[in-house]
């Protein structure tokens, strides 16, 4: 019995289409596939950023695959051909691995790249990123930000930079259509007449960096002799009510501080008839049903009631 063998795929390569980290892995069928004409060949692809402990593995019948990578590091990938037993009339067969790597040749020393990059998607409407210049770079150094997400034909450069002392230290993004729930890729590179500047790459999803506006229209309602209902409204903007969590801070008579986290726009507080003053503030955050992470809003304006006995009336301000 001759042992059946199959070759690895040919021309395996990683192609960078200029999408700042979203790369194409592509290959051609193995040589001498004529023996397996009635056969659906599959490919097992393993890939990772260099330094990562785990490989990502996929099996595909295609000759290409696309995924996002961290271009601050190199990428390594390997692929082999898989034949199920139906192809060989015996046991399953796999080829040896074909391997390839990809990295962007780094320019400049690491200290020249931007520091403390911070991006916030304000109220799920306005993206703003800010950074500090690299360590020890001269004032002639300028940084440029480029971004891409699936849906854009090509990477775009920031058109509205935030400046300090003539240097770009941030970017106000335009309206980003259909940009959430997908990877958002950013590259900040730089130029200087004196020395090369290291590029930095960042990837995140916009729904995970949302900072909402604070809640509005805070009110009190007496529910019973020992209960007061605190109410507020969702902040103006595109974020639906189902996406909010709230944190409340309540102060009674300048002494007792109650904090609570709730999912609705109400909170019922147990009180005593002796309570003379009640104040509360609320802040909001996008919840786990709409994102994996988020940023708390600023606290709302403080709403207080004081003076008259709280049991006497409905409290609205």
């Amino acid at each position: 019995d001759t042992e059946i063998k199959v070759n690895p795929p040919q021309d395996f390569e990683i192609v960078d289409p200029g999408y700042l980290g979203y790369l194409y892995l592509q290959w051609q069928p193995p040589l001498s596939l004529d023996h397996f004409k009635e056969c659906t060949v599959e490919y097992e692809l393993k890939y990772r950023n260099i330094g990562s402990e785990t490989w990502k593995t996929i099996i595909t019948k295609n000759l290409h695959y696309k995924d996002g990578f961290d271009l601050n590091k190199g990428i390594e990938a390997k692929i082999h051909t898989l034949l199920p037993w139906q192809c060989t009339n015996g046991s399953e067969v796999q080829s040896s691995w074909a391997e390839t790597t990809y990295w962007i040749s780094p320019q400049g020393i690491p200290e020249t790249k931007v520091q403390d990059m911070d991006c916030v998607y304000y109220n799920w409407q306005y993206l703003l990123c800010s950074w500090k210049p690299g360590i020890g770079v001269l004032l002639d150094t300028n940084y440029n930000l480029f971004y891409w997400y699936e849906g854009l034909d090509h990477a775009l450069q920031c058109v509205d930079y935030i400046k300090a002392d003539g240097q770009n230290i941030g970017c106000r993004f335009p309206y980003l259509e259909a940009s959430d729930y997908k990877d958002f890729y950013i590259c900040v590179n730089g130029s200087s007449e004196n020395k090369p500047i290291r590029s930095s790459y960042f990837t995140f999803q916009l729904q995970n960096i949302v900072k909402p506006l604070p809640p509005v229209y805070l009110t009190f309602t007496r529910e019973s002799s020992c209960e007061i209902k605190l109410k507020w409204s969702i902040p103006l903007g595109p974020i639906p009510a189902r996406c909010f969590d709230y944190e409340i801070e309540i102060r009674e008579d300048d002494t007792t501080l109650v904090t609570a986290t709730v999912e609705n726009e109400t909170y019922t507080l147990k009180t005593t008839n002796e309570t003379r003053q009640l104040c509360f503030v609320v802040r909001s955050k996008v919840n786990i049903y709409c994102s994996d992470d988020g940023i708390w809003s600023e606290w709302s304006d403080k709403q207080c009631w004081e003076g008259e006995d709280l049991s006497k009336k409905t409290l609205l301000r």
Partner: antibody, heavy 121, light 108 residues
Framework: EVQLLESGGGLVQPGGSLRLSCAAS????????MNWVRQAPGKGLEWVSA????????YYADSVKGRFTISRDNSKNTLYLQMNSLRAEDTAVYYC??????WGAGAFDYWGQGTLVTVSS | DIQMTQSPSTLSASVGDRVTITCRAS??????LAWYQQKPGKAPKLLIY???SLESGVPSRFSGSGSGTEFTLTISSLQPDDFATYYC??????????FGQGTKVEIK
């Protein structure tokens, strides 16, 4: 006649473990890739894991990776799913399924009757 | 991951009707698509594989078509035994294997 018979389901507390088995008959078990698919009460089908015919290739859904382990014993015609660190959201009917053609997964031409796993305190 | 979207979610029809269920993939999956029928309390049953191949023993009133991202399952003349939930499934690239959310065919 092809038959797949799951067993090992039951009630388990969050954080607990279970081992599901699927006894296969009526076909050459060692030649076919096998999979586990689950269905939460009143919900759709969710793929869980796949294993190649020899057992050399194993593949998992992100939701179970690191917690579940698929294996097979071709001498016993049996497929296994070891489930650790179980969560409430793992509550479902678990089906084993035979792959019609392919290395690890594909169209599933035969399914077991399912075994119910309930994760609750 | 490849997302599979079925429409409609529920379909009301009468015996003898021609019924069409659509499945859309978020990216091209060539013809690597299967259709299943599931009745309450039972395991799914393979109807169609490779987008258009009829599984052995399945009545010829079931047919599948499409390639790339758009696929359809057609029941040419609905029979009483056909009231069930139908799922599409891609096996072009995995993990994960992904299913559509299901289409329930109920009696009008």
């Amino acid at each position: 006649e092809v038959q797949l018979l799951e067993s090992g389901g039951g009630l388990v507390q969050p954080g607990g473990s279970l081992r599901l088995s699927c006894a296969a008959s009526g076909f050459t078990f060692s030649r076919y890739a096998m999979n586990w698919v689950r269905q939460a009460p009143g919900k759709g089908l969710e793929w869980v894991s796949a294993i190649s015919a020899s057992g050399g290739g194993t593949y998992y859904a992100d939701s179970v990776k690191g917690r579940f382990t698929i294996s097979r014993d071709n001498s016993k015609n049996t497929l296994y799913l070891q489930m650790n660190s179980l969560r409430a959201e793992d509550t479902a009917v678990y089906y084993c399924a035979k792959v019609r053609y392919g290395w690890g997964a594909g169209a599933f031409d035969y399914w077991g009757q399912g075994t119910l796993v309930t994760v609750s305190s | 991951d490849i997302q599979m979207t079925q429409s409609p979610s529920t379909l009301s029809a009468s015996v003898g009707d021609r019924v069409t269920i659509t499945c859309r993939a978020s990216q091209s999956i060539s013809s690597w698509l299967a259709w299943y029928q599931q009745k309450p309390g039972k395991a799914p049953k393979l109807l169609i594989y490779d987008a258009s191949s009829l599984e052995s023993g399945v009545p010829s009133r079931f047919s599948g078509s499409g390639s790339g991202t758009e696929f359809t399952l057609t029941i040419s003349s609905l029979q009483p035994d056909d009231f069930a939930t139908y799922y599409c499934q891609q096996y072009d690239t995995y993990p994960p294997i992904t299913f559509g959310q299901g289409t329930k065919v109920e009696i009008k």
